[in-house]
């Protein structure tokens, strides 16, 4: 039972769902399912039958390898896909692929929440704003990353003159894309441009 593969792809891309091992020899039937009860395509006795589903017209089966090609995947295509092979012995085998479709992250906007000159030090609070996405944040000061503990949507830090940076970059990323937003300050502690 335990063949489960995870795949993460970017929305709008073309995807190939396949297994890493070779198919059982001289199999009788091969079926791809979307969730456990919806057939996408079935190969049986030298012909493929495509079922009425949201995939009709954008899927193709390669019976040699068992690969299923899906064009223009969308977030709604997130699911567990199952390939079932019926062997000549009259028993079957299943492979499962958990497909996660992610949109590319949008370019973030850096909001300056607070800049304050405090005895030659600069108190800085910047927020990196992107619409409701589950992403990772990385902050850079003049291309040097800030410590791990400061890596979230808000950068709050007090900078001393020796580690003062001119430009601050927020990089937002998910497993399929990343985008940067940058804000630059004029020394000692004022906004220049974004």
């Amino acid at each position: 039972q335990g063949h489960l593969v995870h795949m993460t792809v970017v929305s709008g891309s073309n995807v190939t769902l396949n297994i890493s091992e070779s198919l059982p020899e001289n199999y009788k039937q091969l079926t791809w399912f979307y969730t456990f009860d919806q057939k996408i395509v079935e190969w049986d006795s030298r012909k493929s039958k495509y079922f009425e589903s949201k995939f009709k017209g954008r899927v193709r089966l390669d019976p040699q390898s068992g690969a299923l090609y899906i064009s223009k995947v969308q977030k709604e295509d997130n699911s567990t896909y199952i390939m079932r092979v019926l062997k000549k012995t009259g028993n079957e085998q299943e492979w499962k692929i958990k497909l996660q479709v992610l949109d590319p992250v949008p370019k973030p906007v850096i909001k300056i929440e607070k800049i304050e000159d405090m005895d030659d030090n600069c108190y800085l609070k910047l927020s990196c704003v992107i619409p409701g996405e589950s992403v990772n944040y990385t902050w850079y000061g003049d291309k040097r990353p800030f410590p791990k503990e400061l890596q979230n949507s808000v950068l709050e830090t007090t900078l001393m003159p020796h580690n003062y940076s001119r430009c601050y970059t927020c990089q937002v990323s998910n497993s399929v894309s990343s985008k940067n937003g940058t804000v630059c300050l004029s020394p000692p502690c004022t906004l220049a441009r974004s």
Epitope: Q1, T35, I82, E92
Partner: antibody
Framework: QVQLVQSGAEVKKPGASVKVSCKAS????????MHWVRQAPGQGLEWMGG????????SYNQKFTGRATLTVDKSTSTAYMELSSLRSEDTAVYYC?????????????WGQGTLVTVSS | DIQMTQSPSSLSASVGDRVTITCKAS??????VAWYQQKPGKVPKLLIY???TRHTGVPSRFSGSGSGTDFTLTISSLQPEDVATYYC?????????FGQGTKLEIK
């Protein structure tokens, strides 16, 4: 070995709801879909629906859509079937049955059955 | 929904007889057909799947055949313990459907 143990017999009034449980053991609960089949006295077998315990995806016989609800509790490896708005025709033995695979709903393993009697 | 029509609905045969039960699907189901045996007051027991594959522990006198729309369960030599109701089931397409059953008795 695979075992499916169902809750005990129930007597219900018309219009009421019943919830039958099916506790699975002897295998990895999330690796096989669980289905519910009922049998009215002296009648044949009727498939009600199935659930994938891993994802929570469900599939229902249209006859029961809106009245039957299938759920699982992964922490206790238990499947549930709730049937609402009961009528006398729902008097039957209700079985849970484990599919051989996620996608192959043939049933080698069955619960012992739960008799639900609907009577005023 | 796919209808599964069994015939006969009941039959009586002698010990040692060859018994045949048929099941007709209302549309092509390939070989995705199973057969079950249910004795009075007992849970159904899987006999045959993929139309012709015998389930583990099922005696060799039980065999299945067919594909497409026509399927057959055969008991080559009827034994007293085979008294039961037999059901066919298609699992090609949801919703899953069963035949209405064939009640087998000994003469």
């Amino acid at each position: 070995q695979v075992q499916l143990v169902q809750s005990g017999a129930e007597v219900k009034k018309p219009g009421a709801s019943v919830k039958v449980s099916c506790k699975a053991s002897g295998y990895t609960f999330t690796e096989y879909t669980m289905h519910w089949v009922r049998q009215a006295p002296g009648q044949g077998l009727e498939w009600m629906g199935g659930i994938n315990p891993d994802t929570g995806d469900t599939s229902y016989n249209q006859k029961f859509t809106g009245r039957a609800t299938l759920t699982v509790d992964k922490s206790t490896s238990t499947a549930y079937m709730e049937l609402s708005s009961l009528r006398s025709e729902d008097t039957a033995v209700y079985y849970c049955a484990r599919a051989q695979f996620w996608t192959t709903p043939r049933f080698a393993y069955w619960g012992q059955g739960t008799l639900v009697t609907v009577s005023s | 929904d796919i209808q599964m029509t069994q015939s006969p609905s009941s039959l009586s045969a002698s010990v040692g007889d060859r018994v045949t039960i048929t099941c007709k699907a209302s549309q092509d189901v390939g070989t995705a057909v199973a057969w079950y045996q249910q004795k009075p007051g007992k849970v159904p027991k899987l006999l045959i799947y993929w139309a012709s594959t015998r389930h583990t522990g099922v005696p060799s006198r039980f065999s299945g055949s067919g594909s497409g729309t026509d399927f057959t369960l055969t008991i080559s030599s009827l034994q007293p313990e085979d008294v039961a109701t037999y059901y066919c089931q298609q699992y090609s397409t949801y919703p899953i459907t069963f035949g209405q059953g064939t009640k087998l008795e000994i003469k």
